[in-house]
C-alpha cells in the first residue's frame, strides 16, 4: 500500500538577509489526520518553526491556504531572514493523537543566508610614528555569509602585499568575521596619504566595500630648524629668525633661549601649509646688541607634538658692527613674530 510521503524538493535554498525564504513541502496523502510541523535541525534539540495545528508564528506564513480542503502543500515563507536562520529545515507530518506522534519527515532543506559584510573599519596605531618607521593597520568586517571573502589593502591606490588576514570562526557558523593587519612604511610625504581596506563578497555584486584611514592621523613629521641672522633693522638691533620647516601635525611650541635663559615661549599659530601637507613656521627675535658686553648665544628650541625638544643655536657677536653680521634672508615671514630684547 502507498503510504504518505513528505516531499521537500529543494535540497538547499539560498536567501539574502532581509528577504523571505520559501521552503517547499508537499505531502502525497491526507491520511493520517494530523498536523504538519516545520523544524530547524533534527533530534531532541530541534527548534519548532511552524505548527499547522496551533501556536503563533509571526514570521511564518503558509504559501497555500492550509485550511483549504484537500490542501497537500505545506510550503512556508519565513520573512526577514537573518544569518541566525541558517540551518536545515524539516517538514514533518504528525499523526493525530494524545499526544500527536511523528509519522514521517521530509529529507530536509538546507537554508543558507547570504549576508553582506559590515562596512570595513580601519584603525591605525595608537601613537603617531615618524617616517621610515613601519606601522600596522587593522581592518575588520563582520556578519557576512557565506564564508568566502576577499580582502585587499591599498596605499594611495597601490596594492599592498605585506598583510595577514584571518576569517573566523574556522568551522561552520551562521556568519563570519574577517580581521586583517597590514604593515605600512611611512614616508615624509604621507600626510595626505590614505590606507584603504577593500572587501569583496558575493553579496556585494562586484561593488566592494571600502574602509579608509588617513595617514595624517598616524604620521608625525619632525621639523627641521634653521636659525639665521637678518640685516639690521635699526642701529644696535639684530633680527634673528628661526625657520621651522616641514612639520606635522601643527602642534608646536617654540622657546627662545638667550645664553641658556628662557627669553620667550610661543605656540605655532599662523602657519603656512606645504603641498605635501606639512607646515612651515617662522619666529624672529629682535636683539639689542648694545645691551650686551659679550657674545650672545641664541637658541631656538622647538617642542613638536609632545616630543622631546630639538634646538638650533646661533652665536651673535656683539663686538662686530651690526651691519657686518650675517646677511641671510628669511624665505618666508608669514606669521612672523617679533620681540625686542633689552
Amino acid at each position: 500500500e502507498e503510504e504518505l510521503q513528505v516531499i521537500q524538493p529543494d535540497k538547499s535554498v539560498s536567501v539574502a538577509a532581509g528577504e523571505s525564504a520559501i521552503l517547499h513541502c508537499t505531502v502525497t496523502s491526507l491520511i493520517p489526520v494530523g498536523p504538519i510541523q516545520w523544524f530547524r535541525g533534527a533530534g531532541p534539540a530541534r527548534e519548532l518553526i511552524y505548527n499547522q495545528k496551533e501556536g503563533h508564528f509571526p514570521r511564518v506564513t503558509t504559501v497555500s491556504e492550509s485550511t483549504k480542503r484537500e490542501n497537500m502543500d505545506f510550503s512556508i515563507s519565513i520573512s526577514n531572514i537573518t544569518p541566525a536562520d541558517a540551518g536545515t529545515y524539516y517538514c514533518v507530518k504528525f499523526r493525530k493523537g494524545s499526544p500527536d506522534t511523528e509519522f514521517k519527515s521530509g529529507a530536509g532543506t538546507e537554508l543558507s543566508v547570504r549576508a553582506k559584510p559590515s562596512a570595513p573599519v580601519v584603525s591605525g596605531p595608537a601613537a603617531r610614528a615618524t617616517p621610515q618607521h613601519t606601522v600596522s593597520f587593522t581592518c575588520e568586517s563582520h556578519g557576512f555569509s557565506p564564508r568566502d571573502i576577499t580582502l585587499k589593502w591599498f596605499k594611495n591606490g597601490n596594492e599592498l602585499s605585506d598583510f595577514q588576514t584571518n576569517v573566523d570562526p574556522v568551522g561552520e557558523s551562521v556568519s563570519y568575521s574577517i580581521h586583517s593587519t597590514a604593515k605600512v612604511v611611512l614616508t615624509r610625504e604621507d600626510v595626505h596619504s590614505q590606507v584603504i581596506c577593500e572587501v569583496a563578497h558575493v553579496t556585494l555584486q562586484g561593488d566592494p566595500l571600502r574602509g579608509t584611514a588617513n595617514l595624517s592621523e598616524t604620521i608625525r613629521v619632525p621639523p627641521t630648524l634653521e636659525v639665521t641672522q637678518q640685516p639690521v633693522r635699526a642701529e644696535n638691533q639684530v633680527n634673528v629668525t628661526c625657520q621651522v620647516r616641514k612639520f606635522y601635525p601643527q602642534r608646536l611650541q617654540l622657546t627662545w633661549l638667550e645664553n641658556g635663559n628662557v627669553s620667550r615661549t610661543e605656540t605655532a599659530s599662523t602657519v603656512t601649509e606645504n603641498k605635501d601637507g606639512t607646515y612651515n613656521w617662522m619666529s624672529w627675535l629682535l636683539v639689542n646688541v648694545s645691551a650686551h658686553r659679550d657674545d650672545v648665544k641664541l637658541t631656538c628650541q622647538v617642542e613638536h607634538d609632545g616630543q622631546p625638544a630639538v634646538s638650533k643655536s646661533h652665536d651673535l657677536k656683539v663686538s662686530a658692527h651690526p651691519k657686518e653680521q650675517g646677511s641671510n634672508t628669511a624665505a618666508e615671514n608669514t606669521g612672523s613674530n617679533e620681540r625686542n630684547i633689552y
Partner: antibody
C-alpha cells in the same frame, strides 16, 4: 469526485455483512474513507475511518464489531456479527476529520438486521 | 471520550430570520478547532457546511457561518431560506484520531 455505498440488505443477527464504498474521481492512496450510520429516528453516528493498513481506526464502541479493508477503488466495511441495534442507513464519505472533513457523502445503503 | 451536546433540539424560524445552534464539547476539541457542521435532509446524504470551526466549505452560501473555539461552537444561519429546513449536526474531534463524535442534531423548521 463521488462515493457510493452498496451491499445493504436484510440479514439475520450474527450473519456477517460487508458493505462496499466505491469511489471515483480521487485516489484512495491520498484520502481516507469514513463510515457513518443513522439508525431510524436517530442522529448520525461515527463508526470509523479506513485509510492505509496502519491507518484504520474505529470509534471505541465500534471496535471488534467492525473491520475495514480496501482495494484501489473500493473500501469495505464488514459488520462482523450484526445485531438488531445495527439496523441503520450506512454512509461512506471521503475524509478523516479535522482539516479533512467528510465530503462528499454517498447516498447511503440500508442495513436491516432482523430475525 | 468526547461528548458533544447540541442545543436546541429543534428551532423554528421565519424566512429571512436568523437561526443559531450551539455545540458544547465535554473537553477541548483537537487543535481547538476540530469541529464541522453538516446539514442533513431526509432521504439525502449529509452535506458539509463548515469545517475547522469557521471555514466555509466550497459552494456553501455565505449566510452560513461558524464560530467558536475549544469547547463552545455556534452555527448561525443569517437570512434563513425555506431550503434551509433540515437537521444540522456538529461533528467534534477529540485528541485521538478515532474520537469523532456527532452532536444530537438541531432540527430547523422554516415557517
Amino acid at each position: 469526485r463521488s462515493v457510493e455505498e452498496s451491499g445493504g440488505r436484510l440479514v439475520t443477527p450474527g450473519t456477517p455483512l460487508t458493505l462496499t464504498c466505491t469511489v471515483s474521481g480521487f485516489s484512495l492512496s491520498s484520502h481516507g474513507i469514513s463510515w457513518v450510520r443513522q439508525a431510524p429516528g436517530k442522529g448520525l453516528e461515527y463508526i470509523g475511518t479506513i485509510g492505509t493498513g496502519v491507518i484504520t481506526y474505529f470509534a471505541s464502541w465500534a471496535k471488534g464489531r467492525f473491520t475495514g479493508s480496501k482495494t484501489s477503488t473500493t473500501v469495505d466495511l464488514k459488520i462482523t456479527s450484526p445485531t438488531t441495534e445495527d439496523t441503520a442507513t450506512y454512509f461512506c464519505a471521503r475524509g478523516s476529520a479535522w482539516n479533512d472533513p467528510f465530503d462528499p457523502w454517498g447516498p447511503g445503503t440500508l442495513v436491516t438486521v432482523s430475525s | 471520550a468526547l461528548v458533544m451536546t447540541q442545543t436546541p433540539a429543534s428551532v423554528s424560524a421565519a424566512v429571512g430570520g436568523t437561526v443559531t445552534t450551539k455545540c458544547q464539547a465535554s473537553q477541548s476539541v483537537y487543535g481547538n478547532n476540530d469541529l464541522a457542521w453538516y446539514q442533513h435532509k431526509p432521504g439525502q446524504p449529509p452535506k458539509l457546511l463548515i469545517y475547522l470551526a469557521s471555514t466555509l466549505a466550497t459552494g456553501v452560501p455565505s449566510r452560513f457561518s461558524g464560530s467558536g473555539s475549544g469547547t463552545q461552537f455556534t452555527l448561525t444561519i443569517t437570512g434563513v431560506q425555506s431550503d434551509d429546513a433540515a437537521t444540522y449536526y456538529c461533528l467534534g474531534g477529540g485528541d485521538d484520531e478515532a474520537d469523532n463524535v456527532f452532536g444530537g442534531g438541531t432540527e430547523v423548521v422554516v415557517k
